[in-house]
């Protein structure tokens, strides 16, 4: 009897998640089962299901399967958090790249290589054809999506809506082209799920056909999601166990990223004089083991043969014969030149001591000369002399080299928010240091805040179409989702960056968050064609006390008719009093039957002193805050609006002048709203965008 194939490997798992159908017309099929594998087999074969199964949920508590003809990207559906549920989505329907000739491609690209819209498969206009959905069952000839039902050479194609062009291939990349890794791929978290010879990978949470020790729950930081290629054990490149019982494991064909920028949260801190942690980041020149025996060169095979070569372990700095820790051992080590002693630890290298005395800075800390050498996020500072090239990239004068000694926190670029340093961690290239301003220091960090010298608008004009506000005008509005529900607003200020508030992040687990762009309805109803759902890859917290967060998207947003960026004001600028502004949000409206549509409230700018009076003198506003009062009594931002923008117009240019943060109740009559003044933090925002690497689209 032929062994039934285990198809669960064809699904992407989202733990603690289920799908709720908003559209009652959508069908669901349920049945009691024992395992998720049984659900998967039935979904793949569509056995006994009155629809094409695209996803299923396994209810672990009730031991029940729920099969769906839709997935999380479908319209009329929303994700919901639930401990007892696991969502499995067929990868073919969510993959945006092809494997081989793309026969299994079931994605939603519907535009040809030259940009022509595809003709629906069920239509005979403008081109008559025989590729009817009914004739090609299982090939998913839905809508006008690109497909390759016969597995032809060029990859997925479609008949075009242009009567002059009968058909054309679609420009869908090979998965092996899209996926790339840095170094030896230890930080790779991509979606490659087959080996270089084309074998399908075994799920990490399965023990068949091959038993193994790499259980996801035992190694939560190794990215053991589904059956994607990973490098948890310091191999030369990512690999996986295969579904072939005769091939235990194989490497995966993942190319090296062009710019080779690392994007790993676990990048070790580079040190040269001492060992931090297990010394994986040690880059010093000690070249003997603890008892003085010299090390063997890493590029030599004498006296000991090995595969720890510089070619196999890129980015591990296996230069000369220096002690290193390329494989996650307990500390730096090397092969020795003594034929009788293969390896030895270099335990004579001291541990780094990150202790520091307490101190403070005055003004913006440009004259701070203390010896703190650690960032507020706990990272050790890296040497200034190693980072001069980066520093020159974002300042336009020669920094005072006499101040930039060792790796101490300094402020060579006149940053308004205090001393900082480079870290040696590519994910967090630099950060502020945990030093406070000296008590009683009142030196302003921006001068002339109350004199409207600097205009907020840059010189370029905003394009207004016939002067009619359209949905395009709010394309920068972001709905931040926490566990599949709207939690906060945000503003898209760059394709990969969203400006929002610190208060919007109950959890530090980035998998709990998503950004929805291009929507008008908070549930995404009616926004399917324009909605973009993006994961969050990093949170960059603003300077101490700012309440700001820059949220980096896992991939850049695609700017189109529904998604656009909004401009930032000039640093330290002042907007004239009574300027008309607006706040936007999907938050609490005071209405019982809230329709979920984006709301706007119109406010006008109020000077800080006048604002303080309106708050009965109980509030003293500082240079980092901006005040705006409501034109209509009792309107203004509230819960769910936090993180969203205060948008003002100057010289026909719209800008995000403020960020909504919680504080003093919602829309209290005669109490103007107090927002974070974006102009005060504009240099910080630009510095982050300039220096933090963004993912390639």
């Amino acid at each position: 009897q032929r062994k039934r194939r285990n198809t669960i490997h064809e699904f992407k798992k989202s733990a603690k998640t289920t799908l709720i159908k908003i559209d009652p017309a959508l069908k669901i099929k349920t049945k009691k089962v024992n395992t998720a594998d049984q659900c998967a087999n039935r979904c793949t074969r569509n056995k006994g299901l009155p629809f094409t199964c695209k996803a299923f949920v396994f209810d672990k508590a009730r031991k029940q399967c729920l099969w769906f003809p839709f997935n999380s990207m479908s319209s009329g559906v929303k994700k919901e958090f639930g401990h007892e549920f696991d969502l499995y989505e067929n990868k073919d329907y969510i993959r945006n790249c092809i494997i081989g000739k793309g026969r299994s491609y079931k994605g939603t690209v519907s535009i040809t290589k030259s940009g022509i819209k595809c003709q629906p498969w069920s239509s005979m206009i403008p081109h008559e054809h025989s590729f009817l959905p009914s004739s090609y069952r299982g090939k998913d000839l839905q809508e006008n999506y690109c497909r390759n039902p016969r597995g032809e050479e060029g990859g997925p194609w479609c008949f075009t809506s242009n009567p002059e062009v009968r058909y054309e291939v679609c420009d869908i990349p090979q998965c092996s082209e899209v996926e790339c890794m840095t170094c030896n791929g230890e930080s790779y978290r991509g979606l490659m799920d087959h080996t270089e010879s084309g074998k399908i990978c075994q799920r990490w949470d399965h023990q068949t056909p091959h038993r193994h020790k790499f259980l996801p729950e035992r190694y939560p930081d190794k990215g053991f999601d589904d059956n994607y290629c990973r490098n948890p054990d310091g191999q030369p490149r990512p690999w996986c166990y295969t579904l072939d019982p005769h091939t235990r494991w194989e490497y995966c064909a993942i190319k090296t990223c062009a710019d080779n920028t690392m994007n790993d949260t676990d990048v070790p801190l580079e040190t040269t004089e001492c060992i931090q942690g297990q010394g994986e980041g040690y880059r010093g020149t000690v070249n003997t083991i603890w008892n003085g025996i010299p090390c063997q060169r890493w590029d030599s095979q004498y006296p000991h043969e090995h595969d720890m070569t510089p070619e196999n372990f890129k980015c591990k700095d296996l230069r000369e014969n220096y002690c290193r820790n390329p494989d996650g051992s307990e500390s730096p080590w090397c092969f020795t030149t003594d034929p009788n002693i293969r390896v030895g630890y270099c335990s004579q290298i001291p541990n780094c001591d990150m202790s520091h005395g307490q101190d403070c800075y005055r003004g913006n800390g440009k004259n701070y000369m203390g010896n703190l050498s650690q960032t507020r996020s706990g990272l050790t500072c890296s040497m200034w002399d190693k980072n001069m090239e980066d520093l020159h990239r974002h300042i336009f004068w020669e920094p005072d080299a006499s101040k930039l000694n060792e790796n101490y926190c300094r402020n060579p670029d006149d940053d308004a928010h205090g001393p900082w340093c480079y870290t040696g961690n590519p994910l967090i290239p630099w950060d502020y240091c945990p030093i406070s301003r000296c008590e009683g220091d009142t030196t302003p960090t921006i001068v002339n805040l109350d004199h409207p010298v600097i205009s907020c608008a840059k010189t370029k004009q905003l394009r207004v179409v016939n002067g009619i506000p359209t949905r395009t005008n709010i394309g920068w509005m972001v709905s931040l989702r926490y566990r599949n529900k709207h939690i906060c607003g945000g503003s898209l200020i760059k394709e990969s960056w969203v400006l929002t508030a610190r208060q919007c992040f109950p959890s530090r687990d980035l998998k709990d968050y998503e950004a929805w762009l291009g929507i008008h309805d908070v549930h995404g109803r009616g926004d399917e064609k324009c909605k973009q759902v993006l994961n969050v890859s990093q949170l960059v917290y603003g300077p101490e006390g700012s309440d700001l967060v820059l949220m980096k998207l896992a991939r850049p947003a695609v700017l189109d008719d529904f998604v656009s960026t909004i401009d930032l004001p000039n640093y330290g600028c002042t907007i004239p009093e009574k300027t008309s502004c607006s706040v936007y949000g999907w938050g609490y409206t005071g209405l019982i039957n809230y329709d979920g549509l984006l709301r706007v409230a119109h406010l006008y700018i109020m000077g800080n002193e006048k604002c303080s009076q309106h708050h009965r003198g109980k509030v003293t506003l500082n240079e980092s805050e901006i005040c705006a009062g409501a034109e209509k009594i009792g309107s203004g931002p509230c819960e769910g609006d936090y993180g969203g923008p205060l948008v003002c117009e100057q010289h026909k240019m719209r800008m995000v002048l403020g960020v909504i943060v919680p504080g003093r109740g919602c829309a209290i009559p005669n109490r103007p709203g107090i927002f974070v003044r974006v102009a005060y933090y504009a240099k910080w925002i630009h510095k982050i965008i300039l220096t933090y690497k963004v993912p390639q689209s």
């Epitope: 706990g378 208060q503 109950p506 530090r508 819960e639 919680p662």
Partner: antibody, heavy 115, light 110 residues
Framework: SLEESGGRLVTPGTPLTLTCTAS????????MSWVRQAPGKGLEWIGI??????NPDYASWAKGRFTISRPSTTVDLKITSPTTEDTATYFC????????????WGPGTLVTVSS | AYDMTQTPASVEVAVGGTVTIKCQAS??????LAWYQQKPGQPPKLLIY???TLASGVSSRFKGSGSGTQFTLTISGVECADAATYYC????????????FGGGTEVVVK
Amino acid sequence: SLEESGGRLVTPGTPLTLTCTASGFTIGRYYMSWVRQAPGKGLEWIGIIYTHGVNPDYASWAKGRFTISRPSTTVDLKITSPTTEDTATYFCARVGGFNDYSDIWGPGTLVTVSS
Amino acid sequence: AYDMTQTPASVEVAVGGTVTIKCQASESISTYLAWYQQKPGQPPKLLIYRASTLASGVSSRFKGSGSGTQFTLTISGVECADAATYYCQQGYSYSNVDNAFGGGTEVVVK
């Protein structure tokens, strides 16, 4: 600074509400936690209230037994039906940084549950 | 569930000595771990946050390290004033938590 109030001697089953008041910062801008400590025992995290429409999170043992709320400019902890095991000093704390640690604590208020 | 286990429950140390307290998380919490010091009749006081960053006004004799699931607090050159109970606390996630704090370690200075 922070100050807790409302701690007193109550009989089992009598609901009790503790209040946390802030001075020197705007309480509405921060997540706030409640923590308790029974005499001679360690710190026990009860729960946290966020600044937005997300429901408060509670320790698994505290669900249903406590309710955290934000009436205007204070943060309240309601012990719904106290038992003798709820005798403890109750602290409120401001959650700072990246919302990941408590940087300001109140001095605590003592609740004694006894019949 | 992000539960915290602290060891030892109690430790005795001589003035000038070094004491090491360990804290283990049931799941990876990156570096979102804080250490607090509590003396009898007082609320806890923040010592270290983000696993290794010293809080304002805290002596550099206190040192935190670790990431993922294993963390350490080291007090070197112990002084009489260091006699207290020390607690670790995870700040990675607040949902589905039994106790965000470790059980505590009492440091007795001889």
